[in-house]
Interface confidence: low
């Protein structure tokens, strides 16, 4: 029967004496007038077995003692602490010559456990073991006994047990206790990794090398390993496991995010709350559901605040000008939470007796700086029809307007276009050039913005860069320019008027008249 | 490099006494004990004992005890053997050899680095 | 004291040839055992510890076996740097007493 002792949790006792009940019943050879069990007192007044010899007085001592068989339970080097008083020499008279002051340590490895005899050819010796301090005996009956302790390992083992022996040559040797131990590094989680116990090696200086498992909840970011040293210490950890999406590490393991709380990512970080906006019914949640009317666009992160679309823009205000109409407005009261507002422009065409009746506007309309996607709170919108009815609406949009659209997010202005002048003449061409005429023609212009009252023809020698010029006009797209000088460079300028006033003048047709009475016909843009 | 210099051949009279040195060099003199063979002309090895190289305590065979003697100089790393009263069956090659000195399991048992040997002539 | 019997005497074998040596002890030593190699006028070197630990830069060719009293050491594919004498040594309770010797010859 063995009592409970407690020792560290690196070490793992296969023998100690001091917690046999009763006697130790070890061998001794020889099995007279050597090794002796018997009781004495310990530090605490307890009764504990010991093995003592004391034959100093006589030569030549050859005496053995040898332990019960020792299993190794696996380890490859074990640990032997002894616990020992030995008389010094000096404190004995009369035995110069015949004491010694050392014992000597030995072991033998066998699978046999139950050996009978000591054979001491069969034992290895450890070492010879000396006190660092021997004591000499004052005083027995105040109990005062100064014990020498002594730890030795031996390894590699091999075998399933061992037995240890003790030789005494001449000493007067009190074993008080003999620990038999080895050294594991024990069950331990470091970095959300578990480490089993683990054996040392066989040599003092060897490394073993473990391989942790995640804990629950958990994965490798790296290959978690440890080194169980020689002293049951572990060192040097490599590699570690991370709490899953939706756990946080608590005390070394992986607990569950709580209610109202959550985590995206197998990453070190806790459970944060969910964002504004959002909630998690469940613990473990990966991430927080969005409260009804609110969205998490595509590339919102998880911890982002679940958001809405906008509302409206305020106080649209129109300005038209002819075919033209700047818009501009303000920022919707309500950005929905998030920084990603923009503005699209929607332009229809509405006819002047229903305005149900609209239509998109189409491609020829023109938008400054953009029709979509504006960051301004303004825009030009350019090349309209006259006199048409117009409606614009300026819709606010962020990231999440998608997932629910409605008319709530978009203001709307309707306007009409006034008259406007006629566009620029596109082509005008000389048809006839003679010594002293030109005959110059064209088209209508593009947008004509109403009915053409005339055509205006500007015209002056080139050479005298428009100081001088002048003007002819006629109700007929053609036109002869009579009166002219030969062999002279002309430049010609056409443009239209309507009730609305003058279009713009076309690009200048330059044509140089001849010096010869024949006629040149053609109809290029410059004519010589 | 770890190495064992012995002495030189040594050639005696019956009744002398030679004394031959092991030197050893590149490791701890004190961590290994040093043991000495024999080995006579044409014969085997013979273990003739060992010398502790920490308390110069030495140990001898049943066949080497009385004229033989082990000894040290630990300051010059140097172990001795010195034989006395020479004989004629004396004659041989003596070894030195080291080993660990203390015992750590069987597996470091072996004698792993040995001097080149003293030859010792012994003749009238 | 433990006797060490080592077997053969001699052994007279050709290149490529394989051979094996043998030494039985009068009672367990419990693999303490070792292996030497000896050239004429050298001193031995150490072939194998603990009865099957080939010893640092000793070629594969050579292998130990055994367990209890009977103990082996085995030559593959024997190369001329092989031949000379081989002895056996144990380590179980002094004296350490080495095997006669194996004089191993060319044919």
């Known amino acids: 029967v063995t009592g409970s002792r407690v020792y560290p949790a690196n070490e793992v006792t296969l023998l100690d004496s001091r917690s046999v009940q009763g006697e130790l019943g070890w061998i001794a050879s020889p099995l007279e007038g050597g090794w002796e069990e018997v009781s004495i007192m310990d530090e605490k007044n307890t009764p504990i077995r010991t093995y003592q010899v004391c034959n100093v007085m006589e030569a030549s001592q050859n005496n053995w003692l040898r332990t019960d068989w020792i299993t190794r339970e696996g380890a490859q080097r074990v640990y032997i602490e002894i616990k020992f008083t030995l008389r010094d020499c000096n404190s004995l008279p009369g035995v110069m010559g015949t004491c010694k002051e050392t014992f000597n340590l030995y072991y033998y490895e066998s699978d046999n456990d139950k050996e009978r005899f000591i054979r001491e050819s069969q034992f290895g010796k450890i070492d010879t073991i000396a006190a660092d301090e021997s004591f000499t005996q004052v005083d027995i009956g105040d109990r005062i006994m100064k014990l020498n302790t002594e730890i030795r390992d031996v390894g590699p083992l091999s075998k399933k047990g061992f037995y240890l022996a003790f030789q005494d040559v001449g000493a007067c040797i009190a074993l008080v206790s003999v620990r038999v131990f080895y050294k594991k590094c024990p069950l331990t989680v470091r970095n959300l990794a578990q480490f089993p116990d683990t054996i040392t090696g066989a040599d003092t200086s060897s490394l073993v090398e473990v391989r942790g498992s995640c804990v629950n909840n958990s994965e490798e970011k790296d290959v978690p390993k440890m080194y169980c040293g020689a002293d049951g210490e572990w060192l040097v950890p490599i590699g570690n496991c991370l709490c899953n999406a939706g756990h946080e590490e608590q005390n070394g393991e992986c607990q569950a995010c709580k209610i109202g709380y959550y985590k995206a990512l197998s990453t070190d970080a806790s459970c944060a709350k969910c964002p504004p906006h959002s909630y998690s019914v469940w613990e473990g949640a990966t991430s927080c559901t969005c409260d009804r009317g609110f969205f998490r666009a595509d590339n919102d992160a998880a911890s982002m605040p679940c958001t809405r679309p906008p509302s409206a823009p305020l106080n649209l205000i129109s300005n038209v000008n002819e075919t033209s109409v700047n818009l501009e407005w303000s920022s919707p009261q309500n950005t929905g939470g998030r920084q990603d507002i923009s503005y699209n422009v929607v332009c229809k065409k509405c006819g002047a007796g229903d305005p149900s009746k609209c239509r998109p506007c189409g491609s020829g309309v023109h938008y400054t700086p953009q029709q979509n996607g504006l960051k301004t709170t303004r825009v030009s919108i350019t090349d309209l029809l006259a006199h048409t009815n117009y409606t614009f609406e300026i819709w606010a949009v962020n990231g999440v307007s998608k997932y629910n659209p409605s008319p709530d997010q978009s203001v709307s202005v309707t306007v009409t276009t006034n008259q406007a002048a006629p566009s620029s003449i596109a082509l005008v061409q000389a048809k006839e050039v003679t010594r002293y005429s030109v005959a110059l023609a064209w088209l209508e212009p593009d947008r004509p913005n109403g009915v053409i009252l005339e055509y205006e023809v500007k015209y002056y020698e080139k050479d005298q860069n428009e100081r001088s010029y002048r003007i002819v006009r006629t109700a007929a797209r053609n036109t002869d320019i009579k009166g002219l000088n030969p062999l002279t460079s002309y430049v010609f300028h056409v443009r239209a008027r309507t009730a609305a006033g003058y279009g713009d003048f076309s690009e200048p047709l330059e044509v140089t008249t001849n010096t010869v009475p024949s006629r040149i016909i053609g109809d290029g843009a410059n004519s010589t | 490099q770890i190495q064992l210099v012995q002495s030189g051949p040594e050639l005696k009279k019956p009744g002398e006494t030679v004394k031959i040195s092991c030197k050893a060099s590149?490791?701890?003199?004190?961590?290994?004990?040093m043991h000495w063979v024999k080995q006579a002309p044409g014969k085997g090895l013979k273990w003739m004992g060992w010398?502790?190289?920490?308390?110069?305590?030495?140990t001898y065979a049943d066949d080497f005890k009385g004229r033989f003697a082990f000894s040290l100089e630990t300051s010059a790393s140097t172990a001795y053997l010195q034989i006395n009263n020479l004989k004629n069956e004396d004659t041989a090659t003596y070894f030195c050899?080291?080993?660990?000195?203390?015992?750590?399991?069987?597996?470091?048992?072996?004698?792993?680095?040995w001097g080149a040997g003293t030859t010792v002539t012994v003749s009238s | 004291d433990i006797q060490m019997t080592q077997s053969p005497a001699s052994l007279s074998v050709s290149v490529g040839e394989t051979v094996t040596i043998t030494c039985r002890a009068s009672?367990?030593?419990?693999?303490?055992l070792a292996w030497y190699q000896q050239k004429q006028g050298k001193s031995p070197q150490l072939l194998v510890y603990a009865a099957t630990n080939l010893a640092d830069g000793v070629p594969s060719r050579f292998s130990g076996s055994g367990s209890g009293t009977q103990y082996s050491l085995k030559i593959n594919s024997l190369q001329s740097e092989d031949f000379g004498s081989y002895y056996c040594?144990?380590?179980?309770?002094?004296?350490?007493?080495f095997g006669g010797g194996t004089k191993l010859e060319i044919k």
């Open positions: 040594q144990h380590f179980w309770g002094t004296p350490w007493t």
């Open positions: 050899a080291r080993i660990p000195l203390y015992y750590y399991g069987s597996r470091y048992w072996y004698f792993d680095v």
């Open positions: 590149g490791y701890t003199f004190t961590d290994y004990s």
């Open positions: 009672e367990n030593i419990y693999r303490n």
């Open positions: 010398i502790n190289t920490e308390t110069g305590e030495p």
